[in-house]
Interface confidence: low
């Protein structure tokens, strides 16, 4: 049997494989996989790992072929590659395969984690960074604060995480985050677990602050008493000297 033989990388350079509307979609969406060759091709093949023959093929006299996956199901998710060829390359010879495209078909994305960097306890003057980490790249991340309806911050990230910076003075509070695909049809993740950000040593700070007030008041009382004692003492010394019989 003739099986695909892959030539050296420089010989037939790899094509590019992309997905429309996205690589992450909900079930039932129509997905188009686009394979673009660096030169005019004749046949394009869409491959899944371990398959000898193409899953789908398209014959086009150009650099671009489109593979239509109608009303996708979770089972159609997974790794895809595409190759291109021309008949004069000989039996079974394809180009180098494209980079893997991971297609994810799901109702909901996995829950992200939310952590504080360097930690969830902040000093009055220090900033804190919150990292919302999912499992997928090129997602949009949203940070929420408890008690505030609108998103606090919004980030698009090429990495599978996004960092949100909070100013120290405003940092304390309860936070959560989620992420979603950057364009329609949107696929959302579950909300993260909540994260509580608090003041550094907030209990002893309150105690000290109270004590300072008390010490201040005590100081004022002492100063007042001292003033009165001094006033009284000076009054007594003057009278005898000043009174004549």
């Amino acid at each position: 049997d003739i099986t695909p033989s892959v030539p050296p990388a420089s010989y037939h350079p790899k094509p590019w494989l992309g997905a429309q509307p996205a690589t992450v979609v909900t079930p039932g969406v129509n997905v188009t996989l686009r394979c673009r060759a660096p030169q005019p091709a004749w046949r394009f093949g869409l491959f899944k790992p371990g398959e000898i023959a193409p899953l789908l093929f398209r014959d086009v006299s150009s650099e671009l072929a489109e593979f239509f996956l109608e009303e996708v199901t979770p089972a159609q998710g997974g790794s895809y590659r595409c190759c291109y060829r021309r008949p004069d390359w000989g039996p079974g010879v394809w180009s180098q395969p494209s980079d893997v495209l991971e297609l994810l078909v799901t109702e909901e994305l996995p829950r992200p984690s939310l952590v504080a960097l360097p930690g969830p306890v902040v000093g009055p003057g220090a900033n804190v960074s919150l990292r919302c980490a999912g499992r997928l790249r090129n997602m949009s991340f949203v940070l929420y604060r408890e008690g505030v309806a609108a998103p606090l911050q919004y980030r698009h990230s090429a990495q599978p995480w996004a960092d949100f910076t909070l100013l120290g003075a405003r940092a304390p509070g309860t936070y959560s985050c989620y992420y979603h695909t950057p364009s329609a049809p949107y696929v959302l993740s579950q909300r993260s677990e909540v994260l509580v950000i608090s003041w550094e040593d907030s209990g002893s700070s309150d105690y000290t602050r109270g004590n300072l007030v008390r010490l201040g008041l005590a100081g004022l009382v002492l100063i007042s008493l001292g003033a009165l004692v001094t006033f009284d003492w000076r009054s007594q010394n003057r009278a005898p000297a000043g009174i004549r019989p």
Epitope: I2, G45, I52, A53, D59, P87
Partner: antibody, heavy 120, light 107 residues
Amino acid sequence: QVQLQQSGAELVRPGTSVKVSCKASGYAFTNYMIEWVKKRPGQGLEWIGVINPGSGGTNYNEKFENKATLTADKSSSTAYMQLSSLTSDDSAVYFCARSLDFDGAWFAYWGQGTLVTVSA
Amino acid sequence: DIQMTQSPASLSVSVGETVTITCRASEKIYSNLAWYQQKQGKSPQLLVYAATNLADGVPSRFSGSGSGTQFSLKINSLQPEDFGSYYCQHFWGIPWTFGGGTKLEIK
């Protein structure tokens, strides 16, 4: 050796349908495309379409898109072409062919042909 | 669709002669062309693929040439078994159309 054995001649009524079979042997059926070609008396060859027996994927000549339906049964290594709503224009010899290489090009192996005659 | 124009439509020649059949594509098809021979009541047989490559078992008196839009099939020293019809076919974008054919007859 590679062989494609087609079903026998068919005499059918206009408006009906017919299913032509093409049994493959001598190679891994799912690794090569099966093509279908029409030859009318005194006329040239016309390419109808191709099926990937492994995935069931098909490509049709637009002219035959509403006329021919290509299928394949992996268990019996047989490819089928169903022709529907037959008219006298469908009277022809129909050939199945296997590509030279696994992904489909150059019709290297041919069946013996199936004569379909549409007549009232 | 790409149109394949084959000429001549028919040719009457004697055994031992050399003939050339041409095929013109309506647009550039690079080297994506095949030649077939078909005898009366028989299946077509692949002669040449990728414009110039001789298929297995095909005698060396057959040769294919050309690329782009102009192609030709040359048969040197015609033998009695070479008479029949010849077709070109492109493989550059579906549908894969055939030329109208050239009928080669004995003079």
